[in-house]
């Protein structure tokens, strides 16, 4: 059998605080424990959940936890169930509420000498004890003609008089704690001799030089006094007006009239009513001078047909707030339809081309009127005037591709070459009308071109193929001066291109035919063994049917290429001594010698006293210093070729002779001794 070791028991609990209903069972088999509340299973929540077999409450809730709890243990296998004793909470709580008028039914019915009952809507368990306050001061039973029962939630004032006027609040306490009224009640019972407001002045906004009227009336028994004051507490009467209120009139009924209002009249006006008894009643109203600022400019707008667009008109700052309306062609726009005004917005629903034009936003108040125009363009999809056409452009000349379109607004035209956007540079130029100019057409310009003409409404495009008409030209042009090495084989190439493959042939400039050892093989001039007589002027002629012929003149020089007779050697010199770097070259034409030392050419005219280049090409350096060390290059060149050779120069300190070294001892390295 299932036995309860611990059973839940009824207990006191505090609203919002923790609680625990204990339950522990002993059984032969596995049992499930669950809880019932008023016979219904309790579902676990974050607030209320099973903890082992017990039921834990993180925060007791007087509404959700009222009722009878029971712990049930069940053996699933047999189906046997055991139920604990019932347990419930005595939940202690207190909850704030307002002070309300119980009698009479409404505030309007409160009259002097009537009975007034207020009710304190603070509830709790156990039943709270109440305390009443007027203007924060506690009220006690039988005080100043009122009956108060601290056990009750009602406060009765009988009879109610002006002395009972004030702010009523209540507090209550019980075993849970204390709470005070969430909303208090202001009781106002008039004394006939107190000044009461009949008509209060309202803020006024007037235009400059217009008139302003403030109304003010009080009532009391006997009748009250009424006085007007301006900003600096200056009284305004018909007998004594301040200098800046010369045009002010106070009427018998209390109204104040200001005529021809100026900026200095703007400010706060006070109307003061004083009864025989009671405090003065002060009413304030402000006189504002109407004003209106300028309107911000509109940017021109471009819209597309069929779309819905809105243009917002920001009203200018002004007092009073300016009213705003839209006009088109001098007619005020309606508040509904296809083109209409909504608030400050101009709404164009399903825009048509005919909606284009100037729309005006107007703003107006007492101070005047302002207006601002907005130019609306209805964009159209471009149409063709002239499409780009497949074209043959001549190489080397300017070429044009047209893309002429029309639309509103003026379309923008961009060009693509092989799907790549053409950015304007020295070779490409797009004119305002959309025409593309290719300056100095090149062979590789022969491809597809596409132009796209666009407006916000859409775009059109067309493409054309460009074929480049190649000019007849040498590729590459032969060098006008060329050298051939004497007694060696030599070739002089000449090639050309054109619209048709050109024929190429060589001839001597004097018209004489080529010797038999010289052959012209498809444009390549071939010398089997160059002789002195082969030197001279030659002409390469390229020709085809449609383009005629072109000529390139070449002067061939026969030369003996440079060789070095003497080359500089690796040289080591003592500091302060003289270094000699020898160099001699031969060739035809006779070569010139130049020296380069430490990566700069040694200019014979700027060598200074220590260096000298001999006629035969040798370089001498006197009084060598360590900084003269480095690589020296001898460069030999003539009009046909150039050759160089180099050697290092080392500058070393002269060693101090040791005793063991005799006067005949050789130096440790090859030296030039001078």
């Amino acid at each position: 059998a299932i036995v309860f070791i611990k059973q839940p028991s009824s207990q006191d609990a505090l609203q919002g605080r923790r609680a625990l209903l204990r339950c522990e069972v002993e059984a032969p088999g596995l049992v499930h424990v669950y809880w019932l509340l008023d016979g219904a299973p309790v579902q676990d929540t974050e607030r209320r959940f099973t903890q082992g077999s017990s039921l834990s409450f993180a925060a007791v809730d007087r509404l959700q936890d009222s009722g009878t709890f029971q712990c049930v243990a069940r053996d699933d296998v047999t189906g046997e169930e055991a139920r604990s004793a019932n347990a419930s909470f005595n939940i202690k709580w207190i909850e704030a509420g307002p002070v309300v008028l119980k009698h009479p039914a409404s505030e309007a019915e409160i009259q002097p000498q009537t009975q007034v009952t207020l009710r304190c809507h603070i509830d709790g368990h156990p039943r709270p004890t109440y305390q009443w306050f007027r203007d924060g001061t506690p009220l006690s039973d039988g005080q100043s003609n009122n009956t108060v029962s601290s056990k009750e939630r009602n406060l009765t004032l009988r009879p109610a008089g002006p002395e009972h006027s004030g702010l009523y609040s209540c507090c209550a306490h019980n075993a849970f704690g204390q709470a005070c009224s969430s909303q208090n009640f202001t009781l106002s019972i008039a004394d006939e001799s107190f000044a009461r407001v009949v008509l209060a002045p309202q803020d006024v906004i007037v235009a400059r030089n217009e008139e302003a009227m403030f109304h003010c009336q009080f009532s009391a028994q006997p009748p009250p006094n009424l006085q007007w004051l301006f900003e600096d507490e200056t009284p305004i009467t018909n007998r004594s007006r301040p200098p800046h209120l010369r045009r002010a009139t106070v009427f018998a009924n209390g109204s104040l009239l200001l005529t021809q209002v100026r900026p200095r009249n703007a400010g706060v006006y006070r109307c003061i009513g004083q009864g025989q008894r009671g405090p003065p009643v002060i009413l304030e109203a402000t006189l504002h001078l109407a004003e209106i600022e300028d309107m911000p400019l509109f940017e021109p707008r471009v819209f597309t047909a069929g779309s819905e667009e809105r243009v917002t008109c920001l009203p200018p700052k002004g007092l009073p707030e300016p009213s705003v309306w839209w006009e088109h062609a001098g007619v005020r726009l309606p508040t509904h339809g296809r083109v209409y005004q909504k608030g400050h917005e101009l709404v164009l629903a399903s825009i048509a081309e005919s909606d284009a034009g100037v729309y005006t936003c107007h703003a107006a108040n007492l101070a005047g009127q302002r207006r601002q125009d907005v130019n609306i363009t209805v964009a159209t999809v471009p149409t063709w005037l002239k499409k780009p056409q497949d074209s043959q452009l001549e190489e080397g000349k300017p070429g044009y591709l047209h893309c002429l379109t029309q639309a509103t607004p003026k379309p923008t035209v961009v060009w693509y070459r092989n799907q790549m956007l053409i950015s304007e540079d020295s070779r490409f130029e797009v004119f305002k009308n959309g025409t593309l100019r290719i300056n100095n057409v090149e062979v590789y310009d022969g491809t597809w071109y596409r132009c796209v003409s666009s407006t916000p409404a859409g775009s059109i495009e067309a493409q054309a193929r460009v074929q480049v008409l190649e000019k007849l030209k040498f590729t590459p042009p032969p060098q006008p001066q060329q050298c051939m090495e004497f007694d060696k084989e030599a070739t002089v190439p000449c090639s050309a291109t054109g619209r048709e493959k050109p024929t190429i042939k060589w001839e001597r400039a004097d018209g004489s035919s080529l010797p038999e050892w010289v052959t012209d093989n498809a444009g390549t001039l071939h010398f089997a063994r160059v002789t002195r007589d082969d030197a001279g002027n030659y002409t390469c002629i390229a020709s085809n049917g449609p383009q005629g012929q072109i000529r390139a003149h070449v002067q061939l020089t026969v030369a003996v290429f440079i060789t070095f007779k003497v080359e500089p050697e690796r040289t080591t010199v003592y500091q302060g001594h003289t270094a000699l770097l020898q160099c001699e070259a031969q060739g035809d034409p006779k070569p010139l010698i130049q020296w380069k030392g430490k990566d700069r050419i040694l200019d014979p005219t700027k060598l200074g006293p220590r260096m000298h280049i001999f006629q035969n090409g040798s370089l001498v350096i006197h009084d060598v210093a360590p900084e003269d060390s480095g690589r020296y290059t001898c460069i030999a060149g003539n009009s046909c070729n150039i050759k160089h050779t180099e050697a290092p120069l080392y500058v070393v300190d002269k060693p101090v002779p040791e005793e063991s070294e005799g006067p005949g001892s050789p130096p440790p390295y090859k030296m030039i001794q001078t």
Partner: antibody
């Protein structure tokens, strides 16, 4: 322990039927009792349960249409079935715990 | 809601052979709360195993249960002719809203 069922039969869609299950050989009032059904050729489906204190539980498929009750004085369990549908047709078993089952009663729902 | 999936749907074996039936849960089941039933045509289900591995009263020791978490097994060590039937696994929990597997039919090969 014995569980004897009665009350099955043929009913039209939308009709009502009350099944009964009489228990003997155990203290009926201290046991959880429940109903399980088995449609032809299908698996077993739990339908409803009632605790010893009268707390009730229902499968979503029958909630609002079926009512489980018990009379501890008569050692009897009941299943009141209203608004019957074609998919309610099955053999209904009453059971106590896991090991004790009634012989089953067939409920046929057909127009 | 926990869903129980039994495999295989049908198992064909001969008397004397060993039978292994599987039951997989869609989420973890406390092993204390898994049962196995045997049902023969026209009869009410009969409890074989409860608590995943405990044999019910009068059940021969050739029937054994094992497993934990989401994978459970019913093993019949040596099939007898009377063992050929439909077998169901069942999950029972803190609420008496029990769920059953779709069943495994054990038939003679």
């Amino acid at each position: 322990v014995q569980l004897v069922q009665s009350g099955g039969g043929l009913v039209h869609p939308g009709g009502s039927l009350r099944l009964s299950c009489a228990g003997s050989g155990f203290t009926f009032s201290t046991y959880l009792m429940y109903w399980v059904r088995q449609a032809p050729g299908k698996t077993l489906e739990w339908v409803s349960a009632i605790g010893s204190g009268g707390d009730t539980y229902y499968a979503d498929s029958v909630k609002g249409r079926f009512t489980i009750s018990r009379d501890n004085a008569k050692n009897s369990l009941y299943l009141q079935m209203n608004s019957l549908r074609a998919e309610d047709m099955a053999v209904y078993y009453c059971a106590r715990g896991l090991g004790y089952w009634g012989q089953g009663t067939l409920v046929t729902v057909s127009s | 809601e926990i869903v129980l999936t039994q495999s295989p749907g049908t198992l064909s074996l001969s008397p004397g052979e060993r039978a292994t039936l599987s039951c997989r849960a869609s989420q973890s089941v406390s092993s204390s709360y898994l049962a196995w039933y045997q049902q023969k045509p026209g009869q009410a289900p009969r409890l074989l195993i409860y608590g995943a591995s405990s044999r019910a009263t009068g059940i021969p020791d050739r029937f054994s249960g094992s497993g934990s978490g989401t994978d459970f097994t019913l093993t019949i060590s040596r099939l007898e002719p009377e063992d050929f039937a439909v077998y169901y696994c069942q999950q029972y929990g803190s609420s008496p809203m029990y769920t059953f597997g779709q069943g495994t039919k054990l038939e003679i090969k």
